[in-house]
Interface confidence: medium
């Protein structure tokens, strides 16, 4: 029986050129997380595998950074980034849990918004 629940950052709006943190957390289950996939509609952004670590999709390598935790940071946002994002937790023995985040990217009102930063 699947008992887990996913908490996410929910619906977010951010400014063009800025950065966003997409964050999910799976709770209320003792299932082992084997892999987390981050997807935008039908496109794979990144994978975090428990054994192999992070893999960022080549088309997003320049502006996607892994973390914090199992989350994902998307930088240099464009209006085309607007849409649904999914964190897909593959677990054993429960199976798959999916969290949804809707991102709306708005035209910038202030040019210097959205500083880049390091995730150690």
């Amino acid at each position: 029986m699947m008992t887990g629940t996913i908490e996410t950052t929910g619906n977010i709006s951010a400014e063009k050129g800025g950065s966003i943190i997409l964050q999910c957390h799976l709770s209320s289950t003792t299932a082992q997380v084997t892999q987390v996939n981050w997807e935008q509609q039908d496109q794979l952004l990144a994978i975090c595998n428990a054994d192999l670590g992070w893999h960022i999709s080549p088309s997003f390598k320049d502006r996607v950074a892994p973390g914090p935790g199992l989350g994902l940071t998307l930088q240099s946002l464009t209006v085309n980034d607007t849409g649904e994002y999914f964190c897909i937790y593959h677990t054993y023995p429960d199976g798959t849990y999916t969290g949804r985040i809707f991102l709306e990217v708005l035209e910038s009102s202030v040019a210097e918004h959205g500083a880049r930063f390091q995730i150690p």
């Epitope: 908490e7 950052t9 400014e15 943190i21 997409l22 957390h25 500083a115 930063f117």
Partner: nanobody, 111 residues
């Protein structure tokens, strides 16, 4: 209009403690993060908290810093213990979209 106001910084000796606060207004946030920028360095992520209470920490502060949030006050806190000289920086808070930054609060760890 969204506003973030950080406070609580100051001069502290190595091994000491400080508690930073970040008061947010303008809307309710599902996520708050603390970042820091040391002189001549890039801004780096320190810790973050989801509204439901789940927390994440950079390896460099794990076990020493604790992030928390009071949802009723729309305020995030960063309790910093066992401070080291390398924690010296201006500390900022931000929301999940990092569109808005406060003025920051300076933390100096020195004997």
């Amino acid at each position: 209009e969204v506003q973030l106001v950080e406070s609580g910084g100051g001069l502290v000796q190595p091994g000491g403690s400080l508690r930073l606060s970040c008061a947010a207004s303008g809307r309710t946030f599902s996520f708050m993060g603390w970042f820091r920028q040391a002189p001549g360095k890039e801004r780096e992520w320190v810790a973050s908290v989801l509204r439901g209470g789940y927390t994440w920490y950079a390896d460099s502060v794990k076990g020493r810093f604790t992030i928390s949030a009071d949802n009723s006050k729309n305020t995030a806190y960063l309790q910093m213990n066992s401070l080291k000289p390398e924690d010296t920086a201006v500390y900022y808070c931000a929301t999940e979209s990092m569109d808005y930054w406060g003025q920051g609060t300076l933390v100096t760890v020195s004997s």
